[in-house]
Interface confidence: low
Amino acid sequence: AGVFELQIHSFGPGPGPGAPRSPCSARGPCRLFFRVCLKPGLSEEAAESPCALGAALSARGPVYTEQPEAPAPDLPLPNGLLQVPFRDAWPGTFSLIIETWREELGDQIGGPAWSLLARVTRRRRLAAGGPWARDIQRAGAWELRFSYRARCELPAVGTACTRLCRPRSAPSRCGPGLRPCAPLEDECEAPPVCRAGCSLEHGFCEQPGECRCLEGWTGPLCMVPVSTSSCLGLRGPSSTTTGCLVPGPGPCDGNPCANGGSCSETPGSFECTCPRGFYGLRCEVSGVTCADGPCFNGGLCVGGADPDSAYICHCPPGFQGSNCEKRVDRCSLQPCRNGGLCLDLGHALRCRCRAGFAGPRCEHDLDDCAGRACANGGTCVEGGGAHRCSCALGFGGRNCRERADPCAARPCAHGGRCYAHFSGLVCACAPGYMGARCEFPVHPDGVSALPAAPPGLRPGDPQR
C-alpha cells in the first residue's frame, strides 16, 4: 500500500502565438480544479477505461476573473497535493492522466458549468520511494508543470511497496519473533497487518486482514462490548447488589452493521452508518464503483475500478450527501433581495422579483417613474438607477404626501419675513433689501417698499 502524490506547479497559456488569454468563457469568473487518474501499465488504453490504480480530485482553486487587455498569467491554483492512495503493489509502469477542469461561477441553467479545459496523458516508469519526478506537458494551447512521486505507507516498503517491514527498534535485533527484512538490514519484518479499523485495544490478528476480539468484546472491529451476564433483570439499573446497568436486548447489540459500519439506536430500531462503498440496512451491499454511476445531479465520481475500493462524489452547487443525492435548500440563505421570492430549481437558484425590482437577486431597483406616484403635484426624477420625487412647495417625504412648511428652511434673506401661500411662499423684505428672497440690497438713492402681506397669508416668525 502507498500513495501517489502529484504537485501542480503551474497551469497557463503555453508559449507562442494563439495562446489563450483566459480560461474563463465570456460569461464571467471561473476557477480551476484538477483530476488525476492512474492506470497500470504502459499500453495504449481507451480514455474511458477505469482508473484502476485510483483517482483523485483537487480542491477548487481561487476565483479567476479575466483582466481585459492583460496577458493571461499562470492561473491561480488550488492548494495542496493531489494524493491517490493505492492499496496493492505499485506497478512501476503506469499511465498518468491529468485533467484541468473549469468551473464557471455565473448563474447556470441546466446544471453545473464544469468543462474540461485540458488533458495530458503520460506513460511513465517510476519506482516507489524515489525522488519527485518533474515534468512539463502541453495540451493544446495550455502548458502544465508538475511533479510526482510514489511512496509506500508503513509498514510497506520497497520499490513496489510489497514487503511488510518496519524500522528496527534496536541496532542488534528486531524484536521477538521478527526477522530482519532482507536485503535491508535496518528494517524488520512486520507482524501481520490486522483488518483496517480493528481496535488496537480490544482486537488482535494472526493473519493479515483479520480482526479477532479479546474476551468481552465483539463486532467486526472489536469495538462493541459484550453484554455483561452478571447483571440480571430489566433494561436499566439492576435490582441486584452489583448495581450495574444491563444493556439488555438493544437493537445495536452485537453490532448488526457489517463491513465496519457503525450502529446507532433509533426509536425501536437501529441505523447503520456505512463506510464509503457499502450500502444497505446493515451495510451488506458492496461493490459499488464509479462505473455504476453512483454520483447524482452532475456529481463527479472519483475512485478506483476495484469493487472494494472507495469512490468519492464531488457535488455541484446545490447538492450534498455522499452521492450528491440531497438537494440543498439554498433558499434558506435568503439570497433574493427586496422581498423577492426564491426558487431553488435544483440546477440553479432563481429569484422572482417584486414589481419594480430586477436582476438575478432582485438587487436592481428599476422603478422608472412609470408606476411611481408623486402626490400633490410632485414630479418623479430618475438618475443613476434610482428615482425620487421632487415635491411641490409645501410638500415633502418619499411620495410628497407629507405637508411641509415652506418657511422652515428660512428662505428670506437679510431678516425678511416669510409668508406661506398655497402657490409657494412670499418674502416681506426688511428695509434696504428687495427681490423674491430679499437677496438684493436697495441702492442708496432707491426707494424700498415693504409689500403688504397678501390677504389669506399667515405671517411666519421674522427670520433672524
Epitope: 454511476g293 445531479n297 446545490g318 447538492f319 452521492n323 438537494r327 430549481l345
Partner: antibody
Framework: QVQLVQSGAEVKKPGASVKVSCKAS????????ITWVRQAPGQGLEWMGD?????????NYNEKFKSRVTMTRDTSTSTVYMELSSLRSEDTAVYYC??????????????WGQGTLVTVSS | EIVLTQSPATLSLSPGERATLSCRAS??????LHWYQQKPGQAPRLLIK???QSISGIPARFSGSGSGTDFTLTISSLEPEDFAVYYC?????????FGGGTKLEIK
C-alpha cells in the same frame, strides 16, 4: 434490461393502510431516484413523491400526501416501498413506481412499473 | 404549484395526418418539460424529455418544441399505434405536476 415489477392489486377498507412494493432489476439500484405517481380511474397522473435508494432517508413528498405517505427501500432486495395510510375512497387508483432520469437536477421518468390497483371500499 | 393546461382535451385525426398537441404552464418552467404517452391499461411511456430531447427507442415522428410557458408535441404523420392519451409534465419546481392530458383518437 431495466425492469420495475410492482406488487399485486389490493382491496382496503377506509382508514386502513396499504404498502405497495416495486422491485428493480437490470441497473444499479442505488443509483437512480424512484418516484411514485398515481392515477385515479379515468383521471390524469398525480406525483406523490420520490426516494433516493442510496440513502433511504432522502425523500421528497408532495405536500398533499406528506402526512400519510412513507417511502422506504431495501437495498438487499433492490425494492422500494410506498405506504399510504388513513385510506379514503378517493385514494382508489393505480399506483405506479418509475425510475427517474437525472439531468441537471430535474427529473423525467424513463422506466415505469406495471402499476398496482388499490381499491378503497367499505 | 405550477398548473399545466393541455389543449385540446380531445383531438380527432386520421392516420397519416399531422398532430399538434399543446401544453401551457401557469408560469415559466424553463426547459423542464417532458411528454408521455399512455395507452389503456398500460403505464405511461416517456416520449420527449426537456422540451425537445429525443428518447432512445421512440420513433423520430415525435418531436417537441417551445420554451418558457408554451410547449408543443408534434407527431409528423400519425400511425395507428399513436392513438392514446398524451401527458406533459414539469420538473421545474415542487411539487412535480402533470397536465390533464390530451386524448388523441381516430377520426
Amino acid at each position: 434490461q431495466v425492469q420495475l415489477v410492482q406488487s399485486g392489486a389490493e382491496v382496503k377498507k377506509p382508514g386502513a393502510s396499504v404498502k405497495v412494493s416495486c422491485k428493480a432489476s437490470g441497473y444499479t439500484f442505488i443509483s437512480y431516484w424512484i418516484t411514485w405517481v398515481r392515477q385515479a380511474p379515468g383521471q390524469g397522473l398525480e406525483w406523490m413523491g420520490d426516494i433516493y435508494p442510496g440513502s433511504g432517508s432522502t425523500t421528497n413528498y408532495n405536500e398533499k400526501f406528506k402526512s400519510r405517505v412513507t417511502m422506504t427501500r431495501d437495498t438487499s432486495t433492490s425494492t422500494v416501498y410506498m405506504e399510504l395510510s388513513s385510506l379514503r375512497s378517493e385514494d382508489t387508483a393505480v399506483y405506479y413506481c418509475a425510475r427517474e432520469t437525472t439531468v441537471g437536477g430535474a427529473y423525467a421518468m424513463d422506466y415505469w412499473g406495471q402499476g398496482t390497483l388499490v381499491t378503497v371500499s367499505s | 404549484e405550477i398548473v399545466l393546461t393541455q389543449s385540446p382535451a380531445t383531438l380527432s385525426l386520421s392516420p397519416g395526418e399531422r398532430a399538434t398537441l399543446s401544453c401551457r404552464a401557469s408560469q415559466s418552467i424553463n426547459n423542464n418539460l417532458h411528454w408521455y404517452q399512455q395507452k389503456p391499461g398500460q403505464a405511461p411511456r416517456l416520449l420527449i424529455k426537456y422540451v425537445s430531447q429525443s428518447i432512445s427507442g421512440i420513433p423520430a415522428r415525435f418531436s417537441g418544441s417551445g420554451s418558457g410557458t408554451d410547449f408543443t408535441l408534434t407527431i409528423s404523420s400519425l400511425e395507428p399505434e399513436d392513438f392514446a392519451v398524451y401527458y406533459c409534465q414539469q420538473t421545474n419546481s415542487w411539487p412535480l405536476t402533470f397536465g390533464g392530458g390530451t386524448k388523441l383518437e381516430i377520426k
